[in-house]
Each structure stands twice: as C-alpha cells, then as structure tokens.
Interface confidence: medium
C-alpha cells in the first residue's frame, strides 16, 4: 500500500490509487479504515469529485491532474489523528463495477495531543 508522509499541521492531498479509466465519469468516496469499522469522509458531490476530467475554473477531475493528484482527498492542518489507512472508492455511473485503492497517511512531528481533542473534518477536493 502506498504511503504518504506529511509534517504535522501541513495540508496533504491523498491520491486515489484505484486503477481508474480516464473515460468513465466515476464518483469518488473516501473512508478511513478504523479498527472494527470505517469512518466516511465528507465528500460533497461537486464537479471536482467527478472523474470526467473537466477542469473549469479550478474544478478538478481525474483525467487532468488536480495538483497531480487524481480524485485526491484534501486534508487540511493535519494532526496525529489523521494518521492511518484510507480507502478511496470510484463508483462507475453505469453500476458495472467499483474500483478502490488504499493509501497510508503518516503525520509526523505532532506534539502529544490531549485526549479530548477530536478528529478534524475532511473534504475531498
């Protein structure tokens, strides 16, 4: 599984490693894999989540490179809580099949966190 390292408090784009077809307009979803379950990331259904490689006014698509990261999950101001394994799923609009890929995020250099700190929100961009 590919691994991405980021310094604490930096932003990161997690790439979707699913073997996408450039001509299929997938919809992407992200989950963080947890012990005993999954946590679904926020993925608002906007143009930039669509894999049909439009690139209007900064909207991203998989066929073009949105910051060289197709279907990337943008995590801002990372903390140690963000470390872990993430899975992207690309849904074929015709329902024929879903494609998925995993990526490991390691956030380094974070100070010790207080227990009451909660997970940051995520947004795919």
């Amino acid at each position: 599984t590919p691994e991405v390292k980021v310094a604490c408090s930096e932003d990161v784009d997690l790439p979707c490693t699913a073997p996408w077809d450039p001509q299929v307009p997938y919809t992407v979803s992200w989950v963080k894999l947890l012990e005993g379950g999954e946590e679904r990331m926020e993925t608002p259904q906007e143009d930039h989540l669509r894999g049909q490689h439009y690139h209007q006014k900064g909207q991203n698509g998989s066929f073009d490179a949105p910051n060289e990261r197709p279907y990337s999950l943008k995590i801002r101001n990372t903390t140690s809580c963000n470390s872990g394994t993430y899975r992207c799923t690309l849904q074929d609009p015709d329902g024929q099949r879903n494609l998925s890929g995993k990526v490991i995020l390691r956030v380094t250099g974070c100070p010790a966190q207080r227990k009451e700190e909660t997970f940051k929100k995520y947004r795919a961009e």
């Epitope: 307009p25 439009y54 073009d64």
Partner: antibody, heavy 115, light 109 residues
C-alpha cells in the same frame, strides 16, 4: 497563448503506418488529459482516443483498438497518435484537443489513406 | 446523439435554434449534465461554445445560449450574424464513450 500545433499528416497506402504529433504551448501540458478527434471528408466529428495527464491511462474508440496508439511526452509537451494498419476509412482530418471538455483544439492535420 | 434540423437556413438578425436529443439521460450521478456545444466555421477547427448545458466559454458572444435537461437540449442564437455560419455539434460527456451529434449546418437563406 494557449495553442496546439499539429503535424504528421500525409497520404499513405492502405496497411501502412503514420504518426501524428500535437505540440502544446501556453499551458501546463503535463496536467491535462488529451484527446484525438477525427472528421472524415464531409462528415461529422468522431472521438478517437484519449490519454490521461501522466500517460498512464489510455482509451480508444472500438474502430481503432489494436491499430492506433495514443501517447505523450510531457517533457516535450507533445501528444502523439501512432496509426498502424491504416484503412481507406481512416481518411480524415485528425484533431488533438485538450481535456475532457475539448476546450482547446489543434488546427487539424489531414490523413489520406489511398492506394 | 441526434441533432435537428441537420440544415438550418437563417436570416441575418433573426433568432435560430438547434435541438440535440440523447437516447439516454445525460444527468450524471453527481447532479451535473455534461452536454457541450461546438461551432465549426468553414475551413476551421471546432471551437467549444457551451459546456455543461448552459455555460458559455470565455470569448463567446452572449447571443449564444444553451438550455435543456435530461435528454433534450437546445442551442439558441438570439440574432444570427454572418460570422455564425458553420456547423454546430452537440457532444455528451456523461457516458462513455464520448459521442457527438451529426451536426447542424447553419447557412444564410
């Protein structure tokens, strides 16, 4: 100025090969998917092939599968279409175009397949 | 993708409209409809006018407008000018593979 300049068109015999080129300028070529679209004489537009921004993913129309190969050289800002086993019905003006929305087009290059 | 009419004689200064019909809905699961319009003037390369049904590309005169939903779409020219003569194509990018309409030839009466 954003521009796609094409070259490589020619008159060739059936069964022969030809390589078309599309040189990009005025934008960051390596971050855009690219397409080839063709237009037979007096006919409409027909999508041919596409390649993702990094060249890792390619797709072809059924009528060219196994005969045509799309590729790109990002350091050279150039898109290619290698056409093998050419047939008379491949005769057309071939256009390169930028990204899925086909927002920028080349000037076209004419391929004539004739014996 | 079926366009009509295939030939459209027009009077300069008068409105004109072109229809494009898809055999299946072009509404994508993300809620967007990926239907584009292109203009091809005689002897020139195609040029995109409208993307996603109704969005004009930069530099496209506001006399061009697009509308429609689902399977039926229309390109309208509010007042035809001489430079508008040419062939107009619709193209869908919702479903694989990318497909074009047959083209509508706009010519002066």
């Amino acid at each position: 100025e954003v521009q796609l300049v094409q070259s490589g068109g020619a008159v060739v015999q059936p069964g022969r090969s030809l390589r078309l080129s599309c040189a990009a300028s005025g934008f960051t070529f390596s971050t855009y998917g690219m397409h080839w679209v063709r237009q037979a004489p007096g006919k409409g537009l027909e999508w041919v092939a596409a390649v993702s921004y990094d060249g890792s993913n390619k797709y072809y129309a059924d009528f060219v599968k196994g005969r045509f190969t799309i590729s790109r050289d990002n350091p050279k800002n150039t898109l290619y279409l290698q056409m093998n086993s050419l047939r008379a019905d491949d005769t057309a003006v071939y256009y390169c175009a930028r990204r899925g929305g086909l927002d920028i087009w080349g000037q076209g290059t004419t391929v004539t397949v004739s014996s | 993708m079926t366009q009509s009419p295939l030939s459209l004689p027009v009077t300069l200064g008068q409105p004109a409209s072109i229809s494009c019909r898809s055999s299946q809905s072009l509404i994508h699961s993300d809620g967007n409809t990926y239907l584009d319009w292109f203009q091809q003037r005689p002897g020139q390369s195609p040029r995109r006018l409208i993307y996603k049904v109704s969005n004009r590309d930069s530099g496209v005169p506001d006399r061009f407008s697009g509308s429609g939903s689902g399977t039926d779409f229309t390109l309208r020219i509010s007042r035809v000018e001489a430079e508008d003569i040419g062939v107009y194509y619709c193209m869908q990018a919702t479903h694989w593979p990318r497909t074009f309409g047959q083209g509508t030839k706009v010519e002066i009466k």
